[in-house]
Interface confidence: low
């Protein structure tokens, strides 16, 4: 007699939504061998039994997870082979926060992996990398796990977040850190990586002081071309924090992003504007200090932001977000900059 299982591995990892067939067969000198799968949580419709063989079809659903056993018998002889099936989900859906790091200050960095299964700390690991090495001095905080809100029931996917306390980045600051998430499965290791760019001064590693109007730039592989205004401030489009939700935001030149302009009609005011077609809205999502202390007007594809009471704009980073799509544009305003009537 010969007893064979194909594929022969005792542990098989199957990506959610993909299919796999496991064939168990046995030849028998004395008539037809009895071959069947047992220990199945899945419906019996996923097993096709033929004379001398049995085919288990795994459909890449979470309900396929388990350890079925193929039992083959021929006369008084019997054989068994167990296959541990693990269905996993690990899409490239990493979201990092903040979108960029500022040198010279302590900060908390978070990295979230979305739509994960299994949500097991033993399977999933996070690392904060500088180049190819783990960043020294970063303190990993307790990871968080939460069930994702799913459109379809019966698919309990999770999001897992790792946070780090990050001490002040040294000088010169590195161009970027990376969050790396690794899923370790039987005989399979999967890795996704997301860049967290670090702000760099164009002239000096030091952050700008109150008398300097030198702009900061983001050094990031995903940084788009900066757009300058007459105030000598720089807008810095950054990569979308998650996959785009609408094909309307796509173009051959990359995603359409909001633009930030200076508006002098009513004192010191910033205007964020989207020109990506109908149905797009913009809103201010970040400003130095508390965003609630600013005067905001939001009207569809335009959003204004001004200081209350009217006066010079506060030094720091401003961010405008566009929906759908989630693309953001960042603007750094150096200290002691007053509006110039000749600016456009």
């Amino acid at each position: 007699q010969s007893f064979q299982v194909n594929p022969p591995e005792s542990e098989v990892a199957v990506a959610m939504g993909t299919s796999l067939q496991i064939t168990c067969s046995m030849s028998c000198d004395e008539g037809v061998a009895r071959v069947h799968w047992r220990g199945l949580d899945t419906s019996l419709g996923s097993v096709q039994t033929l004379p001398g063989s049995s085919i288990l079809s795994v459909r890449g659903m979470l309900s396929d997870t388990g350890t079925p056993v193929c039992v083959g018998s021929c006369g008084s002889r019997s054989f068994q082979h167990s296959v541990k099936i693990l269905v996993y989900a690990f899409p490239d859906q990493l979201v990092v926060s903040p979108e960029f790091l500022v040198p010279g200050q302590d900060q908390v960095v978070s990295c979230t992996a979305h739509n994960i299964w299994p949500a097991d700390p033993n399977s999933l690991s996070f690392a904060l990398l500088l180049g190819e090495q783990r960043l020294e001095g970063a303190q990993a905080l307790e990871p968080e796990q939460e069930e994702e809100i799913q459109e379809a029931e019966g698919t309990p996917l999770f999001r897992m977040t790792q946070r780090w306390r990050l001490p002040s980045l040294g000088t010169p600051a590195p161009p970027a850190l990376h969050c790396q998430v690794t899923m370790q499965l039987p005989k399979l290791v999967l890795t996704h990586r997301k860049e967290i760019p670090v702000l760099q001064s164009q002239t000096s590693p030091k952050p700008p002081n109150t008398t300097s109007a030198e702009p900061y730039i983001l050094t990031s592989s995903s940084t788009a071309e900066a757009v300058s205004t007459g105030l000598n401030i720089t807008t810095l489009p950054s990569a979308p924090p998650y996959p785009k939700l609408s094909p309307r935001t796509l173009s051959s030149e990359g995603p359409c992003r909001p633009k930030i302009h200076q508006d002098l009609e009513a004192g010191w005011e910033l205007l964020c504007e989207a020109s990506c077609g109908p149905g797009v809205t913009v809103r201010w999502t970040l400003a130095p200090g508390d965003l609630a202390t600013y005067h905001k007007r939001e009207a569809g594809a335009q959003a204004w932001l001004s200081v209350l009471p009217p006066g010079p704009m506060v030094e720091g980073w401003f961010q405008c977000r566009q929906d759908p799509g989630g693309e953001v544009t960042n603007l750094y305003v150096p200290g002691q900059v007053t509006p110039n009537s000749s600016s456009t």
Epitope: H36, G39, T67, V69, S82
Partner: antibody
Framework: EVQLLESGGGLVQPGGSLRLSCAAS????????MHWVRQAPGKGLEWVSS????????DYADSVKGRFTISRDNSKNTLYLQMNSLRAEDTAVYYC???????????WGQGTLVTVSS | DIQMTQSPSSLSASVGDRVTITCRAS??????LAWYQQKPGKAPKLLIY???SLQSGVPSRFSGSGSGTDFTLTISSLQPEDFATYYC?????????FGQGTKVEIK
């Protein structure tokens, strides 16, 4: 909620017969292998018999082969164990159990006591 | 038949103790092993399956390890409700067989 409820135990003379039943509820009975496991007073657990979801695959422990018959009625969500030619060593609490994954039992009934004595 | 041998047969321990029970199979059974807890007059309760997978709802202080012929059940910090008898069970080949049990008693 998954529930397994055995019945049919009692006192019987050696050589006599009993039929145990196990009523299942709270899950799709017809999708699971079911087993009988017994435990003699003060002793350990002993696997007795198993039956496949459709009833086509049946196995017995050597100690009961030829005397016990396992069966199931999926329309009634019930598992049976027909015990003939009972012996004193068959005295035990009989549990029905649901098998999942790698032939382990995630749910058990509360047990029914079978006493074989003259 | 595959024989399953548990050791020790009984042990006395205190609340908070780390307890280890071993189970040895007479031949290799891969990871086809389960652990059960049984209290007097009650049905067994599944703790561990596949040698190391924790059954849903079972406290994380229970853990299982091993493969082939040697297996271990560990209770990291014994609680009052853990005093019971523990059984291993092989599910690699027929007939399924259980260990003789390990009784965990209060010291």
């Amino acid at each position: 909620e998954v529930q397994l409820l055995e019945s049919g135990g009692g006192l019987v003379q050696p050589g006599g017969s009993l039929r145990l039943s196990c009523a299942a509820s709270g899950f799709t009975f017809s999708s699971y292998w079911m087993h009988w496991v017994r435990q003699a007073p003060g002793k350990g657990l002993e696997w007795v018999s198993s039956i496949s979801p459709g009833g086509s695959n049946i196995d017995y422990a050597d100690s009961v082969k030829g005397r016990f018959t396992i069966s199931r009625d999926n329309s009634k969500n019930t598992l049976y164990l027909q015990m003939n030619s009972l012996r004193a060593e068959d005295t035990a609490v009989y549990y029905c159990a649901r098998e999942v994954q790698l032939s382990h039992y995630d749910y058990w009934g509360q047990g029914t006591l079978v006493t074989v004595s003259s | 038949d595959i024989q399953m041998t548990q050791s020790p047969s009984s042990l006395s321990a205190s609340v908070g103790d780390r307890v280890t029970i071993t189970c040895r199979a007479s031949q290799g059974i891969s990871n086809s092993l389960a652990w059960y807890q049984q209290k007097p007059g009650k049905a067994p309760k599944l703790l561990i399956y596949g040698a190391s997978s924790l059954q849903s709802g079972v406290p994380s202080r229970f853990s299982g390890s091993g493969s082939g012929t040697d297996f271990t059940l560990t209770i990291s910090s014994l609680q009052p409700e853990d005093f019971a008898t523990y059984y291993c069970q092989q599910a690699n080949s027929f007939p399924f067989t259980f260990g003789q049990g390990t009784k965990v008693e209060i010291k």
